[in-house]
């Protein structure tokens, strides 16, 4: 039935990158407020963003408790004021979200090239191991800590003087590639989880080129 003059939320959408996870919905509230609940399939419902006038709710704290669980959220609509003065006290309207499994669905954030070092005709390229909001023993885990060998990086590299790209892959955060002596190269990396069916790849990192600050050149 629902309480008088409230409308159900709609377009419930999960927005998640590197496990930072926000549920968004519509409409902007007019004479109503929202409360969000989240649960695993087997768990109890927990209320978050209580009586909020926002149309988003940060659920990161809940999903990072177990990123491999599947979560469901629902958004309740309550009249803006006490129910007695606004009409019926029936069951509040609510709308369910799609199911969300963080480990399988969180977007991979844009990676960053931390450094590159040339030694002769070899270049070692290191990708920054980004910290997530997932905790273990009171410390925040990195993306590599969470995904382990499920996470690979693809390196795209090319001579500054040409457009032909080469690729390399690693299941660590480092690449060791062969380069032509005396040539400057540019690099970009992409995070990939090959086993996924959705959100498999991140956007490409910003391009870094040799001869700039991040690199180090050693003649052997």
């Amino acid at each position: 039935s629902g309480t008088t003059n409230t409308v159900a939320a709609y377009n419930l959408t999960w927005k998640s990158t590197n496990f930072k996870t926000i549920l968004e919905w519509e409409p902007k509230p007019v004479n109503q407020v929202y409360t969000v609940q989240i649960s695993t399939k087997s768990g109890d419902w927990k209320s978050k963003c209580f009586y909020t006038t926002d149309t988003e709710c940060d659920l990161t704290d809940e999903i990072v408790k177990d990123v491999k669980q599947t979560y469901l959220a629902r958004v309740f609509s309550y009249p803006a004021g006490n129910v007695e003065s606004t009409g019926s006290a029936g069951e509040p309207l609510y709308e369910n979200s799609p199911e969300f499994t963080p480990y399988l669905e969180t977007n991979l954030g844009q990676p960053t090239i931390q450094s590159f070092e040339q030694v002769g005709t070899k270049v070692n390229v290191t990708v920054e191991d980004e910290r997530t909001l997932v905790r273990r023993n009171n410390t925040f885990l990195s993306l590599r800590d969470v995904f382990g060998k499920d996470l690979i990086y693809t390196l795209y590299y090319w001579k500054s003087s040409s457009s032909g790209k080469k690729t390399a892959k690693t299941n660590t955060n480092e690449f060791l590639i062969d380069v032509d002596k005396g040539e400057n190269y540019c690099f970009s990396v992409q995070a990939v989880i090959p086993s996924r069916t959705v959100n498999r790849k991140s956007t490409d990192s910003p391009v870094e080129c040799m001869g700039q600050e991040k690199g180090e050149f050693r003649e052997i």
């Epitope: 902007k28 509230p29 009586y51 004021g81 006490n82 509040p92």
Partner: antibody, heavy 119, light 113 residues
Framework: QVQLVESGGGVVQPGRSLRLSCAAS????????MHWVRQAPGKGLEWVAV????????YYADSVEGRFTISRDNSKNTLYLQMNSLRAEDTAVYYC????????????WGQGTLVTVSS | DIVMTQSPDSLAVSLGERATINCKSS????????????LAWYQQKPGQPPKLLIY???TRESGVPDRFSGSGSGTDFTLTISSLQAEDVAVYYC?????????FGGGTKVEIK
């Protein structure tokens, strides 16, 4: 007239449990959100927990999350606070209060019940 | 969490004089779409529960004498007792109901000078 009457307070040892009740009368209980607010001796007011009119949604202060549970029985016009794993710092007068003109604005309060956690 | 800070901690005012209590919130409690400040004031006398005086920062609860008034917006609020009476001796608390957890100021004790 609106009345809120708390009961269930007393002296309890650390780590033990206690259940507070708040009997409501004089208004449509099932139409109002209800809260617990506490006040340590000689100190200020601290919000503890809230439950929506329908009993579906509950929310807690970080200081009691996971230890306290708010609930209500609309058929009995009664609000409850189950307090587990009690600590010395939970010693306070516990008030139940009802939502007034808006959520979180308390137009009526009970007289309070004193909970003393001491060994 | 929104932190509410009241000043002064205590205040001694002569009967019939004006008493002014300030309350500051760590973030705005103004909701722009309805232009309302989600702030309330309570009075608590010794041995009694608190009593609602003001909500929406400036709306008096029914039955509250008109010597009590509230003002302010955003993060800075004031409760004014225009002419202090003996029965106004109490502790006064501000409270935000903009977002959970709900939070109160530390209280201001008003006494007669």
């Amino acid at each position: 007239q609106v009345q809120l009457v708390e009961s269930g307070g007393g002296v309890v040892q650390p780590g033990r449990s206690l259940r507070l009740s708040c009997a409501a009368s004089g208004f449509t209980f099932h139409s109002r959100g209800m809260h617990w607010v506490r006040q340590a001796p000689g100190k200020g007011l601290e919000w503890v927990a809230v439950i929506t009119y329908d009993g579906i949604n509950k929310y807690y202060a970080d200081s009691v999350e996971g230890r306290f549970t708010i609930s209500r029985d609309n058929s009995k016009n009664t609000l409850y606070l189950q307090m587990n794993s009690l600590r010395a710092e939970d010693t306070a007068v516990y008030y139940c209060a009802r939502d007034g003109v808006y959520y979180g604005v308390y137009d009526y309060w009970g007289q309070g019940t004193l909970v003393t956690v001491s060994s | 969490d929104i932190v509410m800070t009241q000043s002064p901690d205590s205040l001694a005012v002569s009967l019939g004089e004006r008493a002014t209590i300030n309350c500051k919130s760590s973030q705005s409690v103004l909701f722009s779409s309805n232009n309302k400040n989600y702030l309330a004031w309570y009075q608590q006398k010794p041995g009694q529960p608190p009593k609602l005086l003001i909500y929406w920062a400036s709306t008096r609860e029914s039955g509250v004498p008109d010597r009590f008034s509230g003002s302010g917006s955003g993060t800075d609020f004031t409760l004014t007792i225009s002419s202090l009476q003996a029965e106004d001796v109490a502790v006064y608390y501000c409270q935000q109901f903009h977002s959970y957890p709900l939070t109160f100021g530390g209280g201001t004790k008003v006494e007669i000078k």
